[in-house]
């Protein structure tokens, strides 16, 4: 059943669910700061547009009475609890800034008819794809699978002349929330990645991963994993690695690669890092001072969520349209709005598009260098470094299956 | 975090969660009647034992504000919601008569530290196995898999001289809650059933099922499905069936086979029905007058849940032991108590044991007849009809794989 909304007569509210369980271990004060910074910007933009309205956020906190707190694995019902709280308090805004945990978001769509828009800084899993009123402001797993398939198939770059069709995936279950769902999507037999590969095997034990590095009978030279360089080092250490092994390290929400004076450790030489280019303006933002490089994207997603709310409000008010309609609920997609850090594009399903960046370690400079970029909006790869100083033979990525000649 | 309990000083309460979402579409009044009938019996038993205490139930209803109502598929968070409600109202009893939906029960264990005992009339899925404070009073999926594996392997009965190691499973997703989890357990690659079979294929489309019935290239003669005869008829109709096909119809909670004047329709001749023998006393019970044959077991499980609560209360009070301890919470297992209908045995994991009954259709009398019984407690099959009047050749069950001679 539906909940009455604080969303009319010149007063517009966004309900922000402040969850005990979150995709990133970010203090809730930082999230609140990001939201408030966003509200300031929105008020300014609406005022500049001659729209004299009040815009606020109501923060709904979990009471922590019965939930195991912490990561997303025990978050399933927390979003629904907060929705019930909102419903009892008659405090639903025009928009819900919802859970970042996939389990929680999925459950809200499973158990209720959500007829108002929900914005999420997370909800990475495939189970949150194609939700008609959900907008996700951090790259969901589906976008990762699109990149990987595109990159695997690519064979027309100076440094990649082989199409790949095989892969190992390392997934030990201790991953962060984003990695957990990214790897789930690669593992899922129904996913695009699995569908397009002729061989894929999930490695779950450290030893399995370590053995593959020098195994002459391995079925693929490519290993996908998710985490930061430290995570890889714990696993790989300084072990020898066969010369045609390529490790793809997915680390989308980590700006550290772009910081000054960062040197790539030696164990990263066989590794391509998939990340996103950082937004500069955020580095100097008032609310981001206490944020680690891995947290900026999360805070930024909250901030951009508020700006998106403002953008939609402005659009509908300027057109004299009602905000509490299904049309509004379904409108948070297939658009570009002015984010904190530049234009933000949402696809037909409300998922953020971005430019992913594939980095390699230069054997000359020991620096991370951009190999190529990938635009998720048009599913297109653009080579950046035409002659990378790779560790691999002839400065080209090897084939995914080593030709061992007659056996 | 824990909730204070109404469970001391001679006053003992059981909290009964009255869910919108339930494993069986049973009006909540009937559940309430069953609980109240149980309380009357418990009060009598405690009085007879010289224990002068008050025993009550508090019924906790969902407010229906945000949940999709109906079946268990959207029940995940309802149990937690009610637990939150209990927690806010400070109304937790000594025991929780919890959700019947697997999703809901599983989530309660996932998201909270349940340190009080929970009794469920349902929670059939494998994901609710081995929960230290959960007692299930209707046969869970694990027990079904034990029977099937035992029966498949059996080859020393007059009417079954072949071990089977293959099966089709029909599962189209429209099943009732019990069937949904029973079939899930057969489908799951990690389950005992899958583990012990050399071939197993899930048929999801009606046409797949219908084609198998006469397919010369089928990989197994055995098809497991779940539902009542009507469900089978909708699927199979009056189609011809190869003579060595055996359909196992799982219909555990349906007493209609044992009613007087029931004739087995012709389409049931290739079918073995797995059910449970009904309790006679329930048929004349005051609260069961409005119950259909398929609902009696559900109501009985609630009634027996109250009797189990009474039994444990009596045991602990007679021994002068504290009720609000972990010992009490973990004690609802590995015991036999006096149920409404005779002794009820719980295994080491708090799951009810029962006598399953395999029925066949006599080609002479067109009646359902008991072929064998299976005691889940000792994992033992007892043949009942040594010379069944089967439809199958030589009145013996065929091999699961037809020998087609040289191809």
């Amino acid at each position: 059943s539906q909940v009455s909304q604080n969303c009319h007569n010149g007063s517009y509210e966004i309900s922000v669910l402040m969850m005990d369980n979150s995709a990133f271990a970010e203090p809730l004060e930082n999230v609140e700061d990001a939201v408030n910074e966003g509200l300031e910007i929105v008020r300014g933009r609406l005022q500049n547009a001659g729209l004299n309205v009040t815009v606020n956020a109501s923060f709904m906190y979990s009471d922590g009475l019965i939930h195991n707190s912490g990561d997303c694995r025990s978050s399933t019902c927390e979003g629904l609890d907060l929705l019930r709280k909102i419903s009892n308090a008659k405090r639903m805004g025009c928009v819900l800034m919802g859970p970042s945990c996939t389990y929680s978001t999925f459950q809200m769509y499973l158990d209720t008819e959500l007829s108002y828009p929900m914005i999420s800084a997370g909800s990475f899993g495939l189970s949150c794809d194609y939700k008609e009123t959900l907008t996700r402001l951090m790259s969901p797993a589906r976008k990762l699978t699109y990149f990987l398939v595109n990159f695997w198939k690519t064979n027309d770059l100076p440094f990649k002349t082989y199409s790949w069709s095989t892969s190992y995936v390392y997934k030990n279950g201790t991953e962060s929330e984003d990695c957990f769902w990214y790897l789930n999507a690669l593992e899922a037999s129904v996913s695009y990645f699995s569908h397009e590969l002729s061989f894929k095997l999930v490695l779950r034990q450290d030893k399995e991963f370590q053995d593959i590095l020098m195994d002459h009978n391995r079925k693929s030279n490519v290993i996908v994993m998710c985490g930061d360089p430290q995570f890889l080092y714990k696993l790989k250490g300084d072990r020898a690695v066969a010369e045609d092994i390529v490790i793809i390290l997915v680390d989308l929400f980590n700006d550290q690669y772009f910081e000054d004076n960062v040197t790539a450790p030696d164990y990263m030489k066989n590794v391509l890092v998939l990340t996103q280019s950082p937004g500069n303006s955020l580095l100097n933002s008032s609310f981001s001072r206490n944020l680690s490089p891995t947290k900026r994207d999360f805070a930024l997603a909250y901030l951009n969520g508020i700006l998106l709310f403002g953008h939609m409000l402005k659009t509908f008010l300027e057109n004299g349209e009602n905000i509490t309609t299904p049309k509004f609920a379904h409108a948070f997609r297939n658009l570009t709005f002015e984010g904190y850090d530049g234009p933000v594009t949402l696809d037909d399903w409300g998922d953020v598009d971005s430019t992913m960046v594939l980095l390699y370690t230069s054997v000359d400079t020991k620096k991370y260098k951009v190999l190529l970029t990938y635009d998720t909006h048009v599913n297109q790869t653009n080579p950046v470094d035409m002659s990378p100083t790779f560790t691999w033979k002839n400065s080209k990525l090897p084939n995914d299956i080593t030709d061992r000649g007659p056996q | 975090s824990q909730v204070s309990q109404n469970c001391h000083n001679g006053s003992y309460e059981i909290s009964v969660l009255m869910m919108d979402n339930s494993a069986f579409a049973e009006p909540l009044e009937n559940v309430e009647d069953a609980v109240n009938e149980g309380l009357e019996i418990v009060r009598g038993r405690l009085q007879n034992a010289g224990l002068n205490v008050t025993v009550n139930a508090s019924f906790m209803y969902s407010d229906g504000l945000i949940h999709n109502s109906g079946d268990c598929r959207s029940s995940t968070c309802e149990g937690l919601d009610l637990l939150r409600k209990i927690s806010n109202a400070k109304r937790m009893g000594c025991v929780l008569m919890g959700p019947s939906c697997t999703y809901s029960t599983f989530q309660m264990y996932l998201d909270t530290e349940l340190s009080y005992p929970m009794i469920s009339a349902g929670s059939f899925g494998l994901s609710c196995d081995y929960k230290e404070t959960l007692t299930r009073l209707m046969s869970p999926a694990r027990k079904l898999t034990y029977f099937l594996v035992n029966f498949w392997k059996t080859n020393d009965l007059p009417f079954k001289t072949y071990s089977w190691s293959t099966s089709y499973v029909y599962k189209n997703g429209t099943e009732s809650e019990d069937c949904f989890w029973y079939l899930n357990a057969l489908e799951a690659s990690v389950s005992y059933f899958s583990h012990e079979l050399s071939f197993k294929l899930v048929l999801r489309q009606d046409k797949e099922f219908q084609d198998i019935l006469m397919d010369h290239n089928r990989k197994s003669n055995v098809i497991v499905m779940c539902g009542d005869p009507q469900f089978l008829y909708k699927l199979k109709g009056d189609r011809a069936v190869a003579e060595d096909i055996v359909i196992i119809l799982v219909d555990l909670f349906n007493d209609q086979y044992f009613e007087d004047n029931v004739t087995a329709p012709d389409y049931m001749k290739n079918v073995l029905v797995l059910t449970q023998s009904p309790g006679n006393s329930l048929l004349n019970s005051s609260f069961s007058r409005n119950l259909s044959p398929t609902k009696r077991d559900f109501a009985l499980a609630y009634l027996n849940g109250i009797l189990l609560f009474g039994h444990m209360l009596k045991t602990f009070l007679e021994n002068g032991e504290n009720i609000t301890t972990p010992k009490f919470a973990h004690a609802f297992r590995n015991l036999t108590f006096e149920g409404y209908d005779g002794p009820v045995t719980l295994d080491d994991w708090g799951d009810v044991d029962s006598t399953m009954v395999l029925l066949y259709t006599s080609v002479d009398t067109k009646k359902y007849k008991v072929l064998l019984t299976y005691d889940t407690h000792v994992n033992q099959t007892n043949p009942v009809d040594m010379s069944p009047t089967f439809t199958w050749k030589n009145s013996k069950l065929p091999n699961d794989i037809t020998d087609r001679g040289p191809q």
């Epitope: 064979n155 297109q380 035409m386 | -």
Partner: antibody, heavy 118, light 113 residues
């Protein structure tokens, strides 16, 4: 409209180097890769290499590796192709060609004739 | 590298008559990563730069007369001129951009009989 204007014809002695320029206009210079293609008299087209004007990175055809250098100047929207250790068989018309979509040459310069003769 | 083989190498044609040039690649030109086939045709008049006529097998560039059409798939491609005109003389090149590095056919010289 898109225009690629190349420098004029050159006559060089064997062993010398030549540097040909290609000035782009009518589009965002750093948004499109640039290729160099040459054509010896009466012969077909031969791809020489590619430059990314955005970062300056390059990739060259195997047969020119070590002899060719491609550079760019973003301030003047110009790319350069320098070929060293010239031999008589390097006599050809050298074209710059814009990459409209990866490895698709949509616009060509007018060509620069380089003659290598002693 | 992918080898592109054109035939014929020389094509004398009558004005107003159709003409057809074939181009064969040593490997499939279907680019797996996006499902497109990057085969283009270029026309070079005597003393001029090449000009693109067709891209992605069959798409005509703007300003290219509709008497030019491209077809084919996998490894076999064809450029057709429905009615040859005087300005169509010159050399026609096919080029593949589906694999690295890009490669050209050796050219087909079209002249009026």
């Amino acid at each position: 409209q898109v225009q690629l204007v190349q420098s004029g014809a050159e006559v060089k002695k064997p062993g010398a180097s030549v540097k040909v320029s290609c000035k782009a206009s009518g589009y965002t210079f750093t948004s499109y890769y640039m290729h160099w293609v040459r054509q010896a008299p009466g012969q077909g087209l031969e791809w020489m290499g590619i430059i990314n004007p955005s970062g300056g990175s390059t990739s060259y055809a195997q047969e020119f590796q070590g002899r060719v250098t491609m550079t760019r100047d973003t301030s003047t929207s110009t790319v350069y192709m320098e070929l060293s250790s010239l031999r008589s068989e390097d006599t050809a018309v050298y074209y710059c060609a814009r990459d409209g979509q990866w490895l698709q040459f949509d616009y060509w310069g007018q060509g620069t004739l380089v003659t290598v003769s002693s | 590298d992918i080898v592109m083989t054109q035939s014929p190498l020389s094509l004398p044609v009558t004005l107003g008559q159709p003409a057809s040039i074939s181009c064969r690649s040593s490997q499939s030109l279907l680019k797996k990563s996006d499902g497109n086939t990057y085969l283009s045709w270029y026309h070079q008049r005597p003393g001029q730069s090449p000009r693109r006529l067709i891209y992605k097998v069959s798409n005509r560039d703007s300003g290219v007369p509709d008497r030019f059409s491209g077809s084919g798939s996998d490894t076999d491609f064809t450029l057709k001129i429905s009615r040859v005109e005087t300005e169509d003389v010159g050399i026609y090149y096919c080029m593949q951009g589906s694999h690295w590095p890009p490669t050209f056919g050796q050219g087909t010289k079209v002249e009026i009989k």
